[in-house]
């Protein structure tokens, strides 16, 4: 990210270039890779962030692959096609004309096919389960303190409406955060749970997307909460369509 002039920066997305080239010479920030102007008062969509990540200079790229135990998102990074709203296009293809369908968080939900593959609609991920294991501590965290701190984090740092944090479960050392957001519940201006989960995931990995802020310093009653493993599970409004071969593998 480049600060084009005083105060012409994007606090919520460091993967942008900002310039006083907006209407009337106002500051305008465009996402790397796509060139789309982003709203720096809220989170940038995961699709634009992935595209920016893939367009960054190769020596600055970090290939992060989820745990082998993750049920989904085990294809690693790819350079996605985003629609004019910044959402994932339902069908994604690579340079060799291999195509697949994705959900609203960009995770593959069908077998891979060729250019004839049809993805009729972008299926919404309405339930996200973030499964964390924290490093050993002297004692267990107080559940209600932990619950309050994580809810505060999603509300204040990621601007996610509290009603979309459905539950926080805790059985030491495992913490589970449930995010739920149906199409009908999401109003204009609401942060998408998929975007909030992605920002959280990057924060936990020490790869904050926020401009100029320190990394995530999670504390519960002053005690550091250090995460040593993260798994994220995605549930779609319509079940995925994988072949039996994959399901029995």
């Amino acid at each position: 990210h480049t600060a084009a002039q005083d105060n012409c920066t994007c606090p919520t997305n460091k993967m942008t270039v900002c310039s006083p080239d907006g209407p009337g010479g106002r500051c305008q920030c465009r996402a790397l890779g796509s060139g789309m102007a982003v709203d720096c008062s809220t989170l940038t969509s995961k699709c634009l962030l992935l595209k920016a990540r893939m367009s960054a200079p190769k020596n600055a790229r970090t290939l992060v692959r989820p745990s082998e135990h993750a049920l989904v998102d085990n294809d690693g990074l790819y350079d996605p096609d985003c629609d004019p709203e910044g959402r994932f296009k339902a069908r994604q293809c690579n340079q060799t004309s291999v195509c697949w369908c994705v959900n609203s968080v960009g995770v593959r939900r069908t077998d891979k096919g060729d250019l004839s593959l049809r993805c009729d609609e972008l299926v919404r991920t309405h339930h996200i389960l973030i499964d964390l294991r924290h490093r050993p501590t002297a004692g267990a965290f107080n559940h209600s303190d932990l619950d309050a701190e994580l809810r505060r984090l999603f509300r204040e740092r990621y601007r996610l409406h509290p009603k979309f944090v459905a539950a926080v479960h805790y059985e030491q050392p495992t913490i589970q955060i449930e995010l739920r957001q149906n199409t009908s519940q999401k109003a204009a201006g609401d942060v998408d749970i998929g975007d909030a989960a992605y920002y959280f995931e990057r924060d936990i990995k020490g790869e904050s997307l926020f401009q100029g802020r320190g990394g995530l310093d999670l504390r519960v009653r002053g005690e550091p909460l250090q995460v040593e493993r993260t798994l994220i599970y995605y549930l779609d409004e319509i079940p995925p369509k994988f072949s039996m071969k994959r399901l029995t593998a």
Epitope: T2, A4, Q5, C8, V17, S19, P20, D21, G22, P23, G24, G25, Q28, R30, L32, G33, S34, G35, M36, A37, V38, D39, T42, C82, D83, P84, E85, G86
Partner: antibody, heavy 116, light 113 residues
Framework: QVQLVQSGPEVKKPGASVKVSCKAS????????LGWVRQAPGQGLEWMGN????????NYNEKFKGKVTITADTSTSTAYMELSSLRSEDTAVYFC?????????WGQGTLVTVSS | DIVMTQSPDSLAVSLGERVTINCKSS????????????LAWYQQKPGQPPKLLIY???TRESGVPDRFSGSGSGTDFTLTISSVQAEDVAVYYC?????????FGQGTKLEIK
């Protein structure tokens, strides 16, 4: 006032390379995107790519990848567009332009003729 | 890539006549974050670089005569010249600068009868 002044016309042989310059003045060169646009004889406009000189971020139109290289020298406020492996179909006028909503600033154009 | 399609390809009108040039994009150019349409209109005369007339679909660039106006949102846009003058003879282009690669319409040639 804002000005973009391009280098003069070029005549090149097929297979050669050419480097067109665009010198900016009247604004802070490093904080605006600068793009390159091609116009073949009697044809329309095609966006080739752009550069943000302050950080050297560059984007290319997929159609021109491998053909064009865009660079900038912030010390002289000059952007460059190099075309390689020239063919007759690369004969065109090449424009540089400051991008953005208030993007009314274009260079005068540089005619590149490829002929054996 | 976003495809920009202009209509008509050319038109010949009398001085003082009202002219409309249409531009249709294959995808929406409306940015939901700032409610801005990323569409510009340019005028190009022979041997000259394009001249910006309208940006943001409807904002007239400073110094552009008020007979030029732009309208539309999403995928359908219009450039209107309320009363054509002799100096308006040119080729007019619409351009999207919403998502890379930025793309232009094929151009509309305006002539005087």
């Amino acid at each position: 006032q804002v000005q973009l002044v391009q280098s003069g016309p070029e005549v090149k042989k097929p297979g050669a390379s050419v480097k067109v310059s665009c010198k900016a003045s009247g604004y802070t060169f490093t904080i605006y995107w600068l793009g390159w646009v091609r116009q073949a004889p009697g044809q329309g406009l095609e966006w080739m790519g752009n550069i943000f000189p302050g950080s050297a971020y560059i984007n290319y139109n997929e159609k021109f990848k491998g053909k064009v290289t865009i660079t900038a020298d912030t010390s002289t406020s000059t952007a460059y567009m190099e075309l390689s492996s020239l063919r007759s179909e690369d004969t065109a006028v090449y424009f540089c332009a400051r991008e953005g909503s208030n993007s009314g600033y274009w260079g005068q154009g540089t005619l590149v003729t490829v002929s054996s | 890539d976003i495809v920009m399609t202009q209509s008509p390809d050319s038109l010949a009108v009398s001085l003082g006549e009202r002219v409309t040039i249409n531009c249709k994009s294959s995808q929406s150019l409306l940015n939901s974050g700032n409610q801005q349409n990323y569409l510009a209109w340019y005028q190009q005369k022979p041997g000259q670089p394009p001249k910006l007339l309208i940006y943001g679909a409807s904002t007239r660039e400073s110094g552009v005569p008020d007979r030029f106006s732009g309208s539309g949102s999403g995928t359908d846009f219009t450039l209107t010249i309320s009363s054509v003058q002799a100096e308006d003879v040119a080729v007019y282009y619409c351009q999207s600068d919403h998502i890379y690669p930025y793309t232009f319409g094929q151009g509309t040639k305006l002539e005087i009868k």
